[in-house]
Interface confidence: medium
């Protein structure tokens, strides 16, 4: 058993049929010695008396908020949550495996630039009685500060018969050094509590590996006189790190015909303009990637040729 | 470069960008492999890193690029020695068309661009871990290439910025 926060405790249980469970001793936080009784949750049933209560925690029915009373007055509370371990593996019932980039990916994180700011998100099909708490640091043995904001419900989607909920959190490294080579990874720890079930999820990454620029902006087409060609231009996204002479992007451009089956020629360039043949009904698209490190490509930015 | 003269920024830019391409083609899948393990915080100290105080940020380069260039050169020599060591030359043998050979030569080329003949900056001691098992060697190759990718990315940014803003 360990303390998650004041008056909230997590009992770690090996979860299998007829498991013996864990013996837990609760102590009433009061100088009083006599006339103390214990109840669980809203039931008025007295579970025991005395300054301490010893219970055998085996299942969710044994978890909840234990309260010690004297003379009808509540003296202190202890909330017990359960953390299940099945076949030596902690349960992951609350969050959905996103399977990208590999199996057992419950948390996904992205950064738009090297400022030390990043966003993580996760998915669940649970809609109520759910709470999350996030902590983050750089490194684990001598952790450096990362500050995370409040968790928000960022999207709801219907998947077949089920509703899926996406939660996200934004974090910022306290003393980010955008130009340095990261030596220690960022660690993100998410506590998830559903009713009285506790689970925790972790992710470890370097900012450089989760970079995904925003799409290029201000796509413009300028037809060239007496030619089928057009000059296309675009700009770095506003959210990308500066100066651009240092934090450079490379671009992939393509012209896509109306038919998805039509062959697409992709061209790679470090410049922010190009000359292409842009037929009627086609569209021109461009995406960006860090020029010197192969992290994710941005989403496409597109503009119609006509 | 030593003693305060400017490097050939444009040449260094071209060669460092080539290094980035080679480092990723040497093991493109490395990007999708989770090679971090327990105790990695200690093992990552074995390779030189371009850190916050090394003056490799745009402001630091404007103030005095020498600190940063010396740091980059130390790292290049370190990786050049590693790529020429038993870790990469031993079993399992690299494929004949492996870009590691080109990567090795380019590391040497860039470090020499930063130190013309006759100048000798002191370089740090190069550790020579010699894992006995081929699988250990393979894992170490991945880890070295992974950290090299990060190192040369910063070096390439430095030279691109230098070429754009510090060239005479």
């Amino acid at each position: 058993i360990w303390e998650l926060k004041k008056d909230v405790y997590v009992v770690e249980l090996d979860w299998y049929p007829d498991a013996p469970g864990e013996m837990v001793v609760l102590t009433c936080d009061t100088p009083e010695e006599d006339g103390i009784t214990w109840t669980l949750d809203q039931s008025g049933e007295v579970l025991g008396s005395g300054k301490t209560l010893t219970i055998q925690v085996k299942e969710f029915g044994d978890a909840g908020q234990y309260t010690c009373h004297k003379g009808g007055e509540a003296l202190s509370h202890s909330l017990l949550l359960l953390h299940k371990k099945e076949d030596g593996i902690w349960s992951t019932d609350v969050l959905k495996d996103q399977k990208e980039p590999k199996n057992k990916t419950f948390l996904r994180c992205e950064a738009k630039n090297y400022s030390g700011r990043f966003t993580c998100w996760w998915l669940t099909t649970i809609s109520t009685d759910l709470t999350f708490s996030v902590k983050s640091s750089r490194g684990s043995s001598n952790p450096q500060g990362v500050t995370c904001g409040a968790v928000t419900l960022s999207a709801e989607r219907v998947r077949g018969d089920n509703k899926e909920y996406e939660y996200s959190v934004e974090c910022q490294e306290d003393s980010a050094c955008p130009a340095a080579e990261e030596r220690l990874p960022i660690e993100v720890m998410v506590d998830a509590i559903h009713k009285l079930k506790y689970e925790n999820y972790t992710s470890s990454f370097f900012i450089r590996d989760i970079i995904k620029p925003d799409p290029p902006k201000n796509l413009q087409l300028k037809p060239l006189k007496n030619s089928r060609q057009v000059e296309v231009s675009w700009e770095y996204p506003d959210t990308w790190s500066t100066p651009h002479s240092y934090f450079s992007l490379t671009f992939c451009i393509q012209v896509q015909g109306k038919s998805k089956r039509e062959k697409k020629d992709r061209i790679f360039t470090d410049k922010t303009s190009a000359t292409v043949i842009c037929r009627k009904n086609a569209s021109f698209s461009v995406q960006a990637q860090d020029r010197y490190y192969s992290s994710s490509w941005s989403e496409w930015a597109s503009v119609p040729c006509s | 470069v030593p003693g305060g003269s400017s490097p050939a920024w444009a040449q260094c830019q071209q060669l460092s960008q080539k290094l980035c391409t080679l480092a990723w083609s040497a093991h493109p899948l490395v990007g999708h492999m989770d090679l971090r393990e327990e105790g990695d915080e200690e093992t990552t100290n074995d390779v030189p890193h371009i850190q916050c105080g090394d003056g490799c940020d745009p402001q630091g380069l404007r103030d005095n690029s020498q600190f940063c260039l010396q740091r980059i050169r130390q790292g290049l020599i370190f990786y050049e020695k590693l790529l020429g060591s038993d870790i990469f030359t031993g079993e399992p043998s690299l494929l004949p068309d492996s870009p590691v050979g080109q990567l090795h030569a380019s590391l040497l080329g860039l470090s020499q661009l930063l130190q013309p003949e006759g100048h000798h900056w002191e370089t740090q001691q190069i550790p020579s871990p010699s894992p006995s098992q081929p699988w250990q060697r393979l894992l170490l190759r991945f880890k070295i290439l992974r950290s090299l990718q990060a190192f040369v990315a910063v070096a390439a940014r430095v030279f691109a910025h230098g070429a754009a803003t510090l060239s005479p």
Epitope: L4, Q65, S133, A150, V151 | -
Partner: nanobody
Framework: EVQLVESGGGLAQAGGSLRLSCAPS????????MGWFRQVPGKEREFVGV????????YYADSVKGRFTISRDSAKNTVYLQMDSLKPEDTAVYYC???????????????????WGQGTQVTVSS
């Protein structure tokens, strides 16, 4: 949009009791946390206590523990703050706050709450 309406404030003697109510309207509150805060002029709003709507689990600031009790009536969609053994230093404007979905187990800081009531004045005379 969620509105929170507090009631029950007023004047009480030291050692006496008051019961505040907070009724959220405009949205069902399943799975959220409902908190109470208080503020005296010139000071920052201070956490008093919170109840997790489903389950009725409660958490209190040390300064009120044992004297104040938060409860909820699901049928009436109302949260209560029962204040016993009142002290003059409990004098403040009391605010009800709500969080959906709650961002931490027992949210205790201002920024974790999405919705706030207008506040109700509680004065304790010695």
């Amino acid at each position: 949009e969620v509105q929170l309406v507090e009631s029950g404030g007023g004047l009480a003697q030291a050692g006496g009791s008051l019961r505040l109510s907070c009724a959220p309207s405009g949205r069902a509150f399943s799975g959220s946390a409902m908190g109470w805060f208080r503020q005296v002029p010139g000071k920052e709003r201070e956490f008093v206590g919170v109840i997790i709507w489903t389950g009725g689990y409660t958490y209190y600031a040390d300064s009120v523990k044992g004297r104040f009790t938060i409860s909820r009536d699901s049928a009436k969609n109302t949260v209560y703050l029962q204040m016993d053994s009142l002290k003059p230093e409990d004098t403040a404007v009391y605010y009800c706050a709500a969080r959906t979905p709650n961002s931490s187990w027992f949210p205790t800081t201002l920024y974790e709450y999405d919705y706030w009531g207008q506040g109700t004045q509680v004065t304790v005379s010695s």
